[in-house]
Interface confidence: medium
C-alpha cells in the first residue's frame, strides 16, 4: 500500500508567440483545477479500464481575472499534493494523465461551466520511495511543471511497497528512528542523512554525505535553478572557451506533438506520447471512447460496439458542444418577441414582456384599444403596447380630433390644382394630364397612355377620388 | 430519446428481499455509469449504488453496504440491485439514472450526485413495513 503524489509547480502560457494571455473566456473569471489519472504499465491501457490505478482531483484554484495589458503570469493554483492511494504493489512502469480543467464563474445560472484546458501524458518508470521527479510539460499553447513520486504507508517497504515492515515486541538493536523488517532479521531500513543543507525539495541522496539535484537544480545544496547556470542542460557542441555545451536545435523544439502530447528525443528522431483519445506519430488521430467519461454535465455517452469506435454525446437541455461542455445560450435565439427580455434561468426561459404585451414570449399583443375611441370615424390600430388611430380623410392627431387639409401636402402632380372635398379631395389637372392624382400624361392625339378617362369624363376634366 | 425502465418494487416486511431492474439500450448500457438512486419523502434524492456495466468495481452507500448488491446483465442491457435484509428506512422511490463518466469516476460518492445526473427513469415504488 502507498500513495502516489503529484505538486503542481505552475501552469501558464508556453514560450513563444501565440501563446494565451488568459485561461478564462471572455465570459468572465474562472478557476483552475486539475485531475490526475494512473494507469499501469508503460502501453496504451484499454478502454475498458481507465485509471486502474486510481485517480484524483484537486480543489479549485483561487479565482482568477484578466489584467488588460498585464503580462501573462502564471495562474493561481489549487493547494496542496493531489494524492491517489494504491492498494497493492506499485507497479513501477505507468502512464500518468495530468488534466487542467477550467471552472467559468460568470453569470451562469445552474452552476459553472467545465471546460478542459489542456492535458498531458507521461509514461513513466518510478520507484516507490525515490525522490521526487520533476517534470515540464507543454500541452498546445500551455506549459505545465510539476513534480511526482510514489511513497509507502502503513508498515509497507521497499520499491513496490511489497515487502511488510513489522515492528517487534522486543527492543530493537538498531538506532533511534530505524525500521526493523521481518525479512531482514538484524537489519533496519532507513532513508540516509544528506549533506547538511542539502534542499528538501530540490536534492536527494543515495549514500550518506552526498546531495544529488532533481532535473532542474544544480549547485552543491542543488539550490539554484537550472536556467542560471550556463552550462546546465544544453545540447549541441562543447565551447572551446568556456567547457559548457552550446545549445542547439532538437526535434522537440516547437513541439511537434498535437493535441497535447508530450514529446521525448530519441536518438535522431522523436517521439510522441499522446493522452488518452488521440493517436498517430504526432497525436493527430483521435479516439476517445466513452470509457473516458467524455460526456460532462450529465451527458449521455453514445458508441459503437466496439471500444475504439468514435462517441457521441447526448447532452441535457441547456448544454451543447461535442462534450456538453457548453452551456446553450438560449437568448442568443432571440426567442422573446415584441422586444421582450430574455432571461436564461438554466431550468427554463424566462421573457419579460413590455408594457402591452404577454405570453411566454410575450407573443399577445394586449388590446390597446380597449376603452379609447378614435374621433370623427377613425378606427384603433393595436401595436407596440400602444393604441393608434387611423383617421378618416380630412382628420388627424392622436384621437383623430384635428381637422386636417387634405391639399397640405400638395398632392396633385404637374401643376393640378388640389380642392378638399367632404370625402376627401379632388385633383383639377392641367392640360395634357389626368388621374386621381394628375399623374398620368395625356397623349397629344388625345389617347391616354394609360388607363381611358372613364365614360362622361374628359381629360383635364376635375376627377374626384374614390 | 433516452429510455431507462425500471421495474421489481413492491411491498416487503422488513428482513424481506426485493431485486430491482433497469433497462435501457445496448448502446446507454455499454457505455455509461449506470447507477440506483432513491428518494424517501420529504428528503434529498441520494445515491445507492453504481456500476459501470464495460468494467470496473462497484460503489455502495454506507447505509446500504452489506444488504444491496449491484448487478449487471449484458445479454439483456440490464442492471439490477439486489436488496436484501430490507429495513423500513429503506422504504422510498426507487429511481435508475445514467450518464458518462470514466469507470474511476463512477465508483466515487463525490460522482454519484444527483446533479451528475441529467437522464433518470420513472421510478419503482419500494415499501418495507416493520
Known amino acids: 500500500a502507498g500513495v502516489f503524489e503529484l505538486q503542481i509547480h505552475s501552469f501558464g502560457p508556453g514560450p513563444g508567440p501565440g501563446a494565451p494571455r488568459s485561461p478564462c473566456s471572455a465570459r468572465g473569471p474562472c478557476r483552475l483545477f486539475f485531475r490526475v489519472c494512473l494507469k499501469p504499465g508503460l502501453s496504451e491501457e484499454a478502454a475498458e479500464s481507465p485509471c486502474a490505478l486510481g485517480a484524483a482531483l484537486s480543489a479549485r484554484g483561487p479565482v482568477y481575472t484578466e489584467q488588460p495589458e498585464a503580462p501573462a503570469p502564471d495562474l493561481p493554483l489549487p493547494n496542496g499534493l493531489l494524492q491517489v492511494p494504491f492498494r497493492d504493489a506499485w507497479p513501477g512502469t505507468f502512464s500518468l494523465i495530468i488534466e487542467t480543467w477550467r471552472e467559468e464563474l460568470g453569470d451562469q445560472i445552474g452552476g459553472p461551466a467545465w471546460s478542459l484546458l489542456a492535458r498531458v501524458t507521461r509514461r513513466r518508470r518510478l520507484a516507490a520511495g525515490g525522490p521526487w521527479a520533476r517534470d515540464i510539460q507543454r500541452a498546445g499553447a500551455w506549459e505545465l511543471r510539476f513534480s511526482y513520486r510514489a511513497r509507502c504507508e502503513l508498515l509497507a517497504v521497499g520499491t513496490a511497497c511489497t515487502r511488510l515492515c513489522r515492528p517487534r515486541s522486543a527492543p530493537s538493536r538498531c538506532g533511534p528512528g530505524l525500521r526493523p523488517c521481518a525479512p531482514l532479521e538484524d537489519e533496519c531500513e532507513a532513508p540516509p542523512v544528506c549533506r547538511a543543507g542539502c534542499s528538501l525539495e530540490h536534492g536527494f541522496c543515495e549514500q550518506p554525505g552526498e546531495c544529488r539535484c532533481l532535473e532542474g537544480w544544480t549547485g552543491p545544496l542543488c539550490t539554484v535553478p537550472a536556467s542560471t547556470s550556463s552550462c546546465l542542460g544544453l545540447r549541441g557542441p562543447s565551447s572551446a572557451t568556456t567547457g559548457c555545451l552550446v545549445p542547439g536545435p532538437g526535434p522537440c523544439d516547437g513541439n511537434p506533438c498535437a493535441n497535447g502530447g508530450s514529446c521525448s528525443e530519441t536518438p535522431g528522431s522523436f517521439e510522441c506520447t499522446c493522452p488518452r483519445g488521440f493517436y498517430g506519430l504526432r497525436c493527430e488521430v483521435s479516439g476517445v471512447t466513452c470509457a473516458d467519461g467524455p460526456c460532462f454535465n450529465g451527458g449521455l455517452c453514445v458508441g459503437g460496439a466496439d471500444p475504439d469506435s468514435a462517441y457521441i454525446c447526448h447532452c441535457p437541455p441547456g448544454f451543447q458542444g461535442s462534450n456538453c461542455e457548453k452551456r446553450v445560450d438560449r437568448c442568443s435565439l432571440q426567442p422573446c418577441r415584441n422586444g421582450g427580455l430574455c432571461l436564461d434561468l438554466g431550468h427554463a426561459l424566462r421573457c419579460r414582456c413590455r408594457a402591452g404585451f404577454a405570453g411566454p414570449r410575450c407573443e399577445h399583443n394586449l388590446d390597446d384599444c380597449a376603452g379609447r375611441a378614435c374621433a370623427n370615424g377613425g378606427t384603433c390600430v393595436e401595436g407596440g403596447g400602444a393604441h393608434r388611430c387611423s383617421c378618416a380623410l380630412g382628420f388627424g392627431g392622436r384621437d383623430c380630433r384635428e381637422r386636417a387639409d387634405p391639399c397640405a401636402a400638395r398632392p396633385c402632380a404637374h401643376g393640378g390644382r388640389c380642392y378638399a372635398h367632404f370625402s376627401g379631395l379632388v385633383c383639377a389637372c392641367a392640360p395634357g394630364y389626368m388621374g386621381s392624382r394628375c399623374e398620368f400624361p395625356v397623349h397629344p392625339d388625345g389617347v391616354s397612355a394609360l388607363p381611358a378617362a372613364p365614360p362622361g369624363l374628359r381629360p383635364g376634366d376635375p376627377q374626384r377620388y374614390l | 430519446q433516452v429510455r431507462l425502465v425500471e421495474s421489481g418494487g413492491g411491498s416487503v416486511q422488513a428482513g424481506g428481499s426485493l431485486r430491482l431492474s433497469c433497462e435501457t439500450s445496448?448502446?446507454?448500457?455499454?457505455?455509461?455509469?449506470m447507477a440506483w438512486f432513491r428518494q424517501a419523502p420529504g428528503k434529498e434524492r441520494e445515491g445507492v449504488a453504481s456500476?459501470?456495466?464495460?468494467?470496473?468495481?462497484?460503489y455502495y452507500a454506507d447505509s446500504v453496504k452489506g444488504r444491496f448488491t449491484i448487478s449487471q446483465d449484458n445479454a439483456k442491457n440490464t442492471v439490477y440491485l439486489q436488496m436484501d435484509s430490507l429495513k423500513p428506512e429503506d422504504t422510498a422511490m426507487y429511481y435508475c439514472?445514467?450518464?458518462?463518466?470514466?469507470?474511476?469516476?463512477?465508483?466515487?460518492?463525490?460522482?454519484?450526485?444527483?446533479?451528475?445526473?441529467?437522464?433518470w427513469g420513472q421510478g419503482t415504488q419500494v415499501t418495507v413495513s416493520s
Open positions: 439514472a445514467a450518464r458518462s463518466f470514466s469507470i474511476a469516476d463512477c465508483a466515487t460518492q463525490s460522482g454519484i450526485t444527483r446533479s451528475n445526473f441529467a437522464y
Open positions: 445496448r448502446y446507454i448500457y455499454g457505455n455509461n455509469c
Open positions: 456500476i459501470y456495466p464495460a468494467g470496473g468495481r462497484p
